[in-house]
Amino acid sequence: SSPCPQAWGPPGVQYGQPGRSVKLCCPGVTAGDPVSWFRDGEPKLLQGPDSGLGHELVLAQADSTDEGTYICQTLDGALGGTVTLQLGYPPARPVVSCQAADYENFSCTWSPSQISGLPTRYLTSYRKKTVLGADSQRRSPSTGPWPCPQDPLGAARCVVHGAEFWSQYRINVTEVNPLGASTRLLDVSLQSILRPDPPQGLRVESVPGYPRRLRASWTYPASWPCQPHFLLKFRLQYRPAQHPAWSTVEPAGLEEVITDAVAGLPHAVRVSARDFLDAGTWSTWSPEAWGTPSTGTIPKEIPAWGQLHTQPEVEPQVDSPAPPRPSLQPHPRLLDHRDSVEQVAVLA
């Protein structure tokens, strides 16, 4: 059997660090057997069998010129083997961050904080942490570790499914190369890393007969669980075209009636989501949707989405108060947000 321990990586390759002493091992001989060493394709003897180093070649202060293929021969001239030297660095701790788009799963991504120049792989696992004692603030890893399954195709990402919203987790990402391993531990709680995807299906429609109104509607992001234990709240911004500043409102449901739109101008609208108990952070903004208030008169039918008194809207004069903002109350069945939220708008 070979006297050379096989480092992780391709066969026949041995590894060292620039600026350090490197030992190469002749794979096809018995440990301690004297051998001669040559660079592949060069006749010059690098180290003879009388060096006292047996089956090893020592390169002091290795640098990039030492990289390449070496040949070792036994005393009778037989080929002891070929060895390729590759120089690089031991792993540094990877940089790890975790994020959650819902309250049941989270993913962690990583990047090397320093490129080693060597074949590298990552080991990913996690533990669930629990509080020690009812009144204790101390936490200790208690269950696991379990593997954090990595994405196929080499993406630097792993996903924890079926996480508990109120638990804390310790993520372990270990960078491994032939010169060693280095581990980054990251403590995460789902509550702090929760960031929903932006709401979907944003639509902006005019309200016939109301030249200062726009109705915006949207849906929950598809990534939010279908049977929710936790709701989302929303933030809506709108502005007329060419106007730099956004107006912001927090709608009560999945619709909002804007009552102070600028007549005749297109308006940009966007919406963001957050856990309704303020866990984590607001989502990114949805793509903007555009709408222009109507210029016609009110139709004879009451709009299907709500009830409005049927007199046409009177635009307020400069010195008269604006009409009150419609009251938008969510449907009593608050937890089933997949139903359309019933909007009731009553003008005084």
């Epitope: 540094a92 701790r93 940089v95 961050s97 991504t109 990583w110 990047s111 904080s113 320093q114 490129i115």
Partner: antibody, heavy 118, light 107 residues
Framework: EVQLLESGGGLVQPGGSLRLSCAAS????????MTWVRQAPGKGLEWVSS????????QYADSVKGRFTISRDNSKNTLYLQMNSLRAEDTAVYYC???????????WGRGTLVTVSS | DIQMTQSPSSLSASVGDRVTITCQAS??????LNWYQQKPGKAPKLLIY???NLQTGVPSRFSGSGSGTDFTFTISSLQPEDIATYYC?????????FGPGTKVDIK
């Protein structure tokens, strides 16, 4: 010679913007994370931001989050810090540093002074 | 963020004296602690990394010890060129933090 050279500092009004650059030489820039550290006049050192070799992960101090953006161009061996909405408390010498393992700063530039004042 | 405290904030000592600076972290940082020297108008210079390892080219009179939350930096025999401010710095997490510094001068 292994070195880092910052540029782009100067006097700017509150609310203004500035872009700092750090030119690296003498080492394989694209292999290393890079960092900005600042030091207000007469004060201690404060880590500002770091970026991994690929640029895919960035990290910011809370005091600059949302206002500063770190980036890099590995083809030009250059690190950048885009500073927006500058405040008086951002006045400092800004150092570019090369860390090993993200936070072990073995190489520093000479620094560039940023003064935020009206 | 992890808070770092240093003591004393300043000290005066004679040439040849043994000088000791302590650094405390607000939570366990393993041995992810570095020490830097900064002379007036100059950039910081790494002296000790990972609590106790001497950076290449740094004189052996500088040393460090400790792990967890409590760390010590020592100059075994103070030299005139050691007049500077010394900072400890943790990098256990992704937001490195520095201690407030200890200013060392000669009596």
């Amino acid at each position: 010679e292994v070195q880092l050279l910052e540029s782009g500092g100067g006097l700017v009004q509150p609310g203004g913007s500035l872009r700092l650059s750090c030119a690296a030489s003498g080492f394989t820039f694209s292999w290393y994370s890079m960092t900005w550290v600042r030091q207000a006049p007469g004060k201690g050192l404060e880590w500002v931001s770091s970026i991994v070799p690929s640029g895919g992960h960035t990290q910011y101090a809370d005091s600059v989050k949302g206002r500063f953006t770190i980036s890099r161009d590995n083809s030009k061996n250059t690190l950048y810090l885009q500073m927006n909405s500058l405040r008086a408390e951002d006045t400092a010498v800004y150092y570019c540093a090369k860390p090993l393992d993200w936070g072990l700063f073995d190489l520093w530039g000479r620094g560039t002074l940023v003064t935020v004042s009206s | 963020d992890i808070q770092m405290t240093q003591s004393p904030s300043s000290l005066s000592a004679s040439v040849g004296d043994r000088v000791t600076i302590t650094c405390q972290a607000s939570q366990d940082i393993n041995n992810y602690l570095n020490w830097y020297q900064q002379k007036p108008g100059k950039a910081p210079k790494l002296l000790i990394y990972d609590a106790s390892n001497l950076q290449t080219g740094v004189p052996s009179r500088f040393s460090g010890s400790g792990s967890g939350t409590d760390f010590t930096f020592t100059i075994s025999s103070l030299q005139p060129e050691d007049i500077a401010t010394y900072y400890c710095q943790q990098y256990d997490n992704l937001s490195p933090t520095f201690g407030p510094g200890t200013k060392v001068d000669i009596k």
